[in-house]
């Protein structure tokens, strides 16, 4: 019962985590304009992995996709890749874990096969969570570096007469969503791995036999040794193929060059 609960909870936690990773990847607010210690502007800038947006005080919001692939910073490309890998692994993990759930009966699937699949999905969730956390952390590091660089030359002017206020960016909501989601996926993966241990078939060498010694009413139960040969030793290895994930930016009518944070 505890195993089923652990496995089910692991699945639900991972499902929430992966949904969060997908949400974070799609969100536009990875970096938002820093409002602290800045002149109050009637324009608010924020940027995501796929496009940058500007919200005017009037209520009008304009977003532009990043059209160039080669013109984007390598770090941004790396973050995109990490998030997509995290989503793909998580999605495959969810698919595998559905069939591995103890509460779901599929034909005459053995417990050893379910244990193997539970472990596979657990590992996938752990890697997926780590990818998301890594991706968000790389982006956050990029923001911190650029923040202090722009703070160093916050005001660049011509002879001190005309000033240009440099837009500084700080952590957006997507970063926190990504961190929490990555953590949940990681926790879910660990729970699946723990559940897997309980799912592994217990093979004992001896049947429990009661020995009744004369004059004594004490029962001896020898054995109790687990003779398992490790996880998945008696199941066939299954190859899981990834068809590859492609993301296309939505087509906008006016391409523009963007200096990314």
């Amino acid at each position: 019962m505890a195993v089923t609960a652990c496995q089910g909870l692991g699945f639900v936690v991972s499902l929430i985590g992966i949904a969060g990773i997908i949400a974070a990847t799609c969100m536009d607010q990875w970096s938002t304009q820093d409002l602290y210690n800045n002149p109050v502007t009637a324009v608010f800038n924020y940027q995501g992995l796929w496009r940058s947006c500007v919200r005017e005080s009037s209520g009008f919001t304009e977003c532009r996709g990043y059209f160039t692939l080669l013109g984007l910073p390598a770090m941004l490309q790396a973050v995109r890749a990490l998030m997509i890998v995290g989503i793909v692994l998580g999605a495959i993990g969810l698919l595998v874990s559905i069939f591995a759930l103890k509460c779901i009966r599929i034909g005459s699937m053995e417990d050893s096969a379910k244990a193997n699949m539970t472990l596979t999905s657990g590992i996938m969730f752990i890697v997926s969570g780590l990818c998301a956390i890594a991706g968000v952390s790389v982006f956050a590091n990029m923001l911190v570096t650029n923040f202090w660089m722009s703070t160093a030359n916050m005001y660049t002017g011509m002879g001190g007469m005309v000033q240009t206020v440099q837009t500084r960016y700080t952590f957006g909501a997507a970063l926190f969503v990504g961190w929490v989601a990555g953590g949940l996926t990681l926790i879910g993966g660990v729970m699946m791995c723990i559940a897997c241990r309980g799912l592994a078939p217990e093979e004992t060498n001896y049947k429990a036999v009661s020995y009744h010694a004369s004059g004594h009413s004490v029962a001896y139960k020898p054995g109790g040794f687990k003779a398992s040969t490790g996880f998945g030793s008696n199941t066939k290895n299954k190859k899981i193929y990834d068809g590859g994930a492609r993301t296309e930016d939505e087509v906008q009518s006016y391409p523009s060059k963007h200096d990314y944070v």
Partner: antibody, heavy 118, light 113 residues
Framework: DVQLVESGGGLVQPGGSRRLSCAAS????????MYWVRQAPEKGLEWVAF????????YYVDTVKGRFTVSRDNPKNTLFLQMTSLRSEDTAMYYC???????????WGQGTSVTVSS | DIVMTQSPSSLTVTAREKVIMNCKSS????????????LSWYQQKPGQPPKLLIY???TRKSGVPDRFTGSGSGTGFTLTISSVQAEDLAVYYC?????????FGAGTKLELN
């Protein structure tokens, strides 16, 4: 057709109060930020205040901060400017305006005149 | 506060003449996020409220004649009337739409010779 009609202007004594109203029609009022701009006799335009569509952000020019309060009633399609501690330099034609692209005032009312004099 | 300086303060022109008026801001009104300049131009005729002509420094409001052209970037902007008509005689104001308070220039008065 977009229409903005200001009312509530008139003669006020220094230190007195006045509440200006701006009735909007012909557009979805609750979706637009709104401005108040004034123009002293034979002078240029002076931006006074701004309120976002949902009233979450309000901004004032320094000369009216603490004395003027801008508010709006979206269901009634009305914008307000509550003016207190009025001074002679507040004498002006007060215009309400709707914000459009680029935070510009794309539509203006005809204005209401406020005269602060003893 | 951002200071908007308009020049000249008044212009005396003849019909069908090309007119250029300037507006300078004390800080850049350019937003790197969308590559736009947050400056607008208004026309005010005597006894009337102002009327928006140009926003985003160069985008004409619908219904505004194409003889009105806005240009410039950062801190320097111009409004050009390619061929002045009698109905164009008015005061023209530029406005900072980027930093609060959204200050106006003192205006350029266009008069007929």
């Amino acid at each position: 057709d977009v229409q903005l009609v200001e009312s509530g202007g008139g003669l006020v004594q220094p230190g007195g109060s006045r509440r200006l109203s701006c009735a909007a029609s012909g557009f979805s009022f609750s979706n637009f930020g709104m401005y108040w701009v004034r123009q002293a006799p034979e002078k240029g335009l002076e931006w006074v205040a701004f309120i976002t569509s949902d009233s979450t952000s309000i901004y004032y020019v320094d000369t009216v901060k603490g004395r003027f309060t801008v508010s709006r009633d979206n269901p009634k399609n009305t914008l307000f400017l509550q003016m207190t501690s009025l001074r002679s330099e507040d004498t002006a034609m007060y215009y309400c305006g709707r914000t459009g692209y680029g935070n510009a005032m794309d539509y203006w009312g005809q204005g209401t005149s406020v005269t602060v004099s003893s | 506060d951002i200071v908007m300086t308009q020049s000249p303060s008044s212009l005396t022109v003849t019909a069908r003449e090309k007119v250029i008026m300037n507006c300078k801001s004390s800080q850049s009104l350019f937003n790197s996020g969308n590559q736009k300049n947050y400056l607008s131009w208004y026309q005010q005729k005597p006894g009337q409220p102002p009327k928006l002509l140009i926003y985003w420094a160069s985008t004409r409001k619908s219904g505004v004649p194409d003889r009105f052209t806005g240009s410039g970037s950062g801190t320097g902007f111009t409004l050009t009337i390619s061929s002045v008509q009698a109905e164009d005689l008015a005061v023209y104001y530029c406005q900072n739409n980027y930093f609060y308070p959204l200050t106006f220039g003192a205006g350029t008065k266009l008069e007929l010779n």
